[in-house]
């Protein structure tokens, strides 16, 4: 089952998946001036059996002005663009991709790739959160967002991160706790 | 179903203590921050601060700090607020609400009455 | 802390009519913005989050926009149901900040 919306946006925070389950699709855009191939496919999608999960589907872009299809390359690292769901300051890996069942890890890079990849995400995805750069963690607690289906209806859980600029902690007590891998889960709510 | 149920309506005098508390259900209580916010006779909304049920830690309003005390035990899912010396002025409605940017569901409301 | 302006502080409309409430923040707030109303003796409930994101349950005459420090609420034809006291709260800086409130009167 796809999640009907985006994770939520919080304050001075990005979200980052550290591993995609089975049913994710990437949709195949390609930056501007460049088209998915004829023949390319539309999106990505993670599919898998018990013991290994992988990312069916090839990503493939071509010029717009010509008819040539182009051939996949990994792009050198300062061609990598940023995009919404890797532009976290710091590595942050709460689970290691490999190792969790039912999941894809990121797909790597494609020749002439949007600037943005777009996820269309199913039921049980994670995604977790960290303050922007110039921000900090008020507090350790949960920093995730769960999709879950409650009441026929499916909806992210709302992330408990709460980051601040330096000048607005300083007039608050109490010791500034670092930002830690999400322990409790903010996600288990009562269904109907 | 998400529900915050708070305690009842208080009369009190200058200079007593009090406690009043906000029990929380239908959701996982100890990892979702609780909100409280006053609201006097015939007046508008004020946020006063916030607290997280798991570990009671607390952030307050400026206007607020050192007035009142937040505090949660997780293990009833139940977050209060307190205070040791009541003034006339702390006389408003106290909402219990849960965070932590906007608030998505409401307590009833306790009423606290401070009077000589 | 941030300061939320509401305005205006009262206003008188029949039902039918289409009511904009405006909030301006000191401060820019990106779309950090929640609506709420609330009805005399009762809890405020939440409308809008994220400047013009309408909460579940919420009627869609109920409108949210703006982003920075000015932001509209709309209710695009009044009920009978919304005669009540709407209130802005910006939670892009800590602490988070309520304006004082405007009163939606029967004319």
């Known amino acids: 089952e796809l999640c009907d919306d985006d994770p939520p946006e919080i304050p001075h925070a990005t979200f980052k998946a550290m591993a995609y389950k089975e049913g994710t699709m990437l949709n195949c855009e390609c930056k501007r001036g460049f088209r998915r191939i004829k023949s390319g496919s539309l999106y990505m999608l993670c599919t898998g059996n018990s013991s290994h999960s992988s990312w069916d589907n090839q990503c493939q872009c071509t010029s717009s002005a010509t008819r040539n299809t182009t051939k996949q390359v990994t792009p050198q690292p300062e061609e990598q663009k940023e995009r919404k769901t890797t532009e976290m300051q710091s590595p942050m890996q709460p689970v290691d991709q490999a190792s969790l069942p039912g999941h894809c890890r990121e797909p790597p890079p494609w020749e002439n790739e949007a600037t943005e990849r777009i996820y269309h995400f199913v039921v049980g995805q994670m995604v977790y959160y960290q303050c922007v750069q110039g921000y900090r963690a008020l507090h350790r607690g949960p920093a995730e967002s769960v999709c879950k289906m409650t009441h026929g209806k499916t909806r992210w859980t709302q992330p408990q991160l709460i980051c601040t600029g330096e000048m607005e902690t300083s007039q608050f007590p109490g010791e500034e706790k670092p930002q830690a891998s999400p322990e409790g889960r903010p996600e288990s709510e009562t269904s109907c | 179903e998400v529900q915050l149920v708070q305690s009842g309506a208080e009369v009190k005098k200058p200079g007593e203590s009090l406690k009043i508390s906000c029990k929380g259900s239908?959701?996982?209580?100890?990892?979702?921050?609780i909100v409280w916010v006053r609201q006097m006779p015939g007046k508008g909304l004020e946020w006063m601060g916030i607290?997280?049920?798991?570990?009671?830690?607390?952030r307050y309003s400026p206007s607020f700090q050192g007035q009142v005390t937040f505090s949660a035990d997780k293990s009833i899912s139940t977050a209060y607020l307190q205070w040791s010396s009541l003034k006339a002025s702390d006389t408003a409605m106290y909402y219990c609400?849960?965070?932590?940017?906007?608030?998505?569901?409401w307590g009833q409301g306790t009423l606290v009455t401070v009077s000589s | 802390d941030i300061q939320m302006t509401q305005s205006p502080s009262t206003l008188s409309a029949s039902v039918g009519d289409r009511v904009t409430i405006t909030c301006r923040a000191s401060?820019?707030?990106?779309?950090?913005l929640a609506w709420y109303q609330q009805k005399p003796g009762k809890a405020p409930k939440l409308l809008i989050y994220?400047?013009?994101s309408l909460e579940s349950g919420v009627p869609s005459r109920f409108s949210g926009s703006g982003s920075g420090t000015e932001f509209t609420l709309t209710i695009s034809s009044l009920q009978p149901d919304d005669f009540a006291t709407y209130y802005c709260?910006?939670?892009?800086?800590?602490?988070?900040?309520f304006g004082q409130g405007t009163k939606v009167e029967i004319k």
């Open positions: 401060q820019s707030i990106s779309s950090w």
């Open positions: 994220k400047a013009s």
């Open positions: 607290t997280y049920p798991d570990d009671s830690e607390t």
């Open positions: 609400t849960r965070g932590p940017y906007y608030s998505d569901y």
């Open positions: 709260q910006q939670y892009d800086r800590f602490s988070w900040t």
């Open positions: 239908g959701y996982n209580f100890a990892n979702y921050w």
